[in-house]
């Protein structure tokens, strides 16, 4: 039969609120060398127990009886500390455990989760979370909006999750946790109502260096929009934008628009260039989220200057004309050059030279054309750039007016009519 237990004092019970500090104590009387006292919680040895052991001899001899006291200190009581506690000793070849003591938690509800501050778009549904526990259970929750209860009594309304169908003004939310011991109130969460994301961002008109864009504002609750911000970024290297990244790969061009109207002219852009644009609108509460990036492109323009360094030389019945690309911006893809030449009393001849930068003109007959001049213009898909100033060809045989023909086989009439002011006709009879 089992030997008599050496324990003469068993752990007591502790019940209290979170954060409480308490001590469990057990005492035993043994003969001979005092054993080490271990503590069990729910059958498991506590390896990192905050325990102290005191040993007092009851006689002069080491083999006499000893009183051993072990104290287990529980600091800042938590739910994980609750359970059944026992002392355990190994004496010789026998194991002894004390009678159990119990550690319980009982107090005001304790929040595991509280509502968090957040921003929401006006009139947009969202959820808030609140979770509390005892013991004692049950714990009933009561939600409050702007300090006003959202249910008639704790436990009657929404519990862990509050669904808010939408707000039109910045509001505060908190939750109360009720149990048999009383009430705990959570932190107060501020829900800031921002404008909704603008919709339908689109192009109204396009110019080579400017885009006019418009959008539809979203709802902003009781707070009027103060302004909208438009961002544009070059998208030729904007792989990040294509991939849906939230931030552009380079510093965007940012413009502010007073509202209304919900429209903005973006200037100082590069012609014939792809951009991505987005817009966000701001109220006194803060900015909306950005719209998705919208790909747009400025159209081509006409070249801003004439071809450079035009030289026209004559050798007998031939005239050789060459030039260089305009130094001024082309505003698009250069498609070619047009050349116009004219004598004093002869009709103007227009030629499309293509992308070549030189041409030889056959001046038929042996007479010279007086005051022969040549003009050159570059063109893109958008049209002609400005014509160069007339470059004169000196008469080869003065007084001989021969008809002028072109050596190249381009049609002598223009492919489409030219605005008259592009031509530089300063010839006099």
């Amino acid at each position: 039969q089992a030997e008599e237990s050496p324990f003469v004092g068993n752990p007591g019970n502790i019940t209290g609120a979170r954060g409480l500090t308490g001590t469990l104590r057990c005492q035993l009387q043994v003969q001979g060398e005092p054993p080490e006292v271990h503590w069990l919680r729910d059958g498991q040895i506590l390896e990192l127990a905050d325990s102290t052991q005191t040993q007092v001899p009851l006689g002069e001899d080491e083999q006499d009886d000893w009183i051993v006291v072990s104290q287990l200190r529980i600091t800042s009581l938590q739910l994980s500390d609750t359970g059944q506690y026992q002392c355990l000793v190994f004496l010789g070849h026998q194991t002894f455990v004390s009678q159990p003591g119990y550690v319980g938690l009982e107090g005001l509800p304790y929040f595991l989760e509280e509502p968090e501050d957040r921003t929401v778009a006006a009139n947009t549904p969202f959820n808030l979370s609140c979770q509390a526990q005892g013991p004692p259970e049950p714990v009933d929750l009561l939600w409050l909006q702007d300090a006003v209860p959202l249910a008639t009594a704790p436990g009657h309304g929404p519990q862990r999750s509050l669904h808010v169908p939408g707000l039109n003004k910045t509001s505060s939310f908190s939750c109360e946790a009720h149990n048999a011991k009383g009430v705990t109130t959570s932190r107060t969460a501020t829900i800031t109502v921002l404008p909704q994301q603008p919709r339908n961002l689109h192009l109204v008109s396009r110019q080579p260096t400017e885009l006019e864009v418009a959008w539809t504002p979203g709802l902003s609750g009781i707070y009027p929009l103060t302004h909208c911000t438009l961002q544009a970024v070059l998208s030729d290297d904007g792989m990040g934008i294509q991939a849906g990244e939230p931030d552009p790969p380079e510093e965007p061009l940012t413009s502010q628009a007073s509202v209304p109207p919900h429209q903005l002219r973006l200037g100082s852009l590069h012609p014939h260039t792809p951009y991505h644009i987005r817009v966000a609108c701001t109220s006194s509460q803060g900015p909306s989220s950005w719209t998705h990036w919208l790909p747009v492109e400025t159209p081509e323009g006409v070249p801003l200057g004439p071809p450079e360094n035009i030289s026209a030389t004559r050798n007998g019945s031939q005239a050789f004309v060459h030039w260089q690309e305009p130094r001024a911006p082309l505003q698009g893809t250069l498609l070619g050059y047009r050349l116009a030449y004219q004598g004093q009393d002869t009709p103007e001849v227009l030629m499309d030279i293509g992308l070549r930068q030189e041409v030889t003109l056959e001046l038929q007959g042996d007479g010279s054309v007086s005051n022969l001049t040549v003009c050159v213009a570059a063109y893109t898909a958008a049209g002609d750039g400005p014509w160069s100033l007339p470059v004169p060809l000196e008469a080869w045989r003065p007084g001989q007016a021969q008809p002028v023909h072109q050596l190249v086989k381009e049609p002598s009439t223009p492919a489409f009519s030219w605005p008259h002011h592009h031509h530089h006709h300063h010839h006099h009879h």
Partner: antibody
Framework: QVQLVQSGAEVKKPGASVKVSCKAS????????INWVRQAPGQGLEWMGW????????KYNEKFKGRVTMTRDTSISTAYMELSRLRSDDTAVYYC?????????WGQGTLVTVSS | EIVLTQSPDFQSVTPKEKVTITCSAS?????MYWYQQKPDQSPKSLIY???NLASGVPSRFSGSGSGTDYTLTINSLEAEDAATYYC?????????FGQGTKLEIK
Amino acid sequence: QVQLVQSGAEVKKPGASVKVSCKASGYPFTDFYINWVRQAPGQGLEWMGWIYPGSGNTKYNEKFKGRVTMTRDTSISTAYMELSRLRSDDTAVYYCARSTGFFDYWGQGTLVTVSS
Amino acid sequence: EIVLTQSPDFQSVTPKEKVTITCSASSSIGYMYWYQQKPDQSPKSLIYLTSNLASGVPSRFSGSGSGTDYTLTINSLEAEDAATYYCQQWSSNPPTFGQGTKLEIK
């Protein structure tokens, strides 16, 4: 001396329940935890849970929650383990073991065979 | 849960040899326990609190270790030591066992 004596082998059909007993002697039954550990054929050891006979408190391995129930009868120093909704992979030897922070004494084991 | 991995899974040794079985824990633990199980028998406690011999266990058995690495040593192996040896932890719930090391005597 400490002894744990278990009930005999059982053969059960899938979906049935089995109840194994463990009679303790040689120590104060209500002071020590009784654990249940199982061992499938040719396999290792798997802890199922414990009961504290003094109070009847139990703690189960999450794997068996909802299927295992541990009880005791202090008048006859006997602990019981019932496993329900048996499946073929519940075929194993089921041991009771006294614990003092570890398993210091073990029953002889009860073979439970689940077969249709 | 804490996973215990024993090494080796199987060992064939001659009597009088020294045998070392290791047990590695997936997280740090405070104490290790060791059990011996002979064929068709229930497990028997061998070592408790890492290094203490259970009642009736011969002194040729010893245990050591800390943190994640623990060792069971059998000095001068005897024929009756042929068995499967299991390590076990209860530093965190649930208590878990190693997969076992089978010791065969040549």
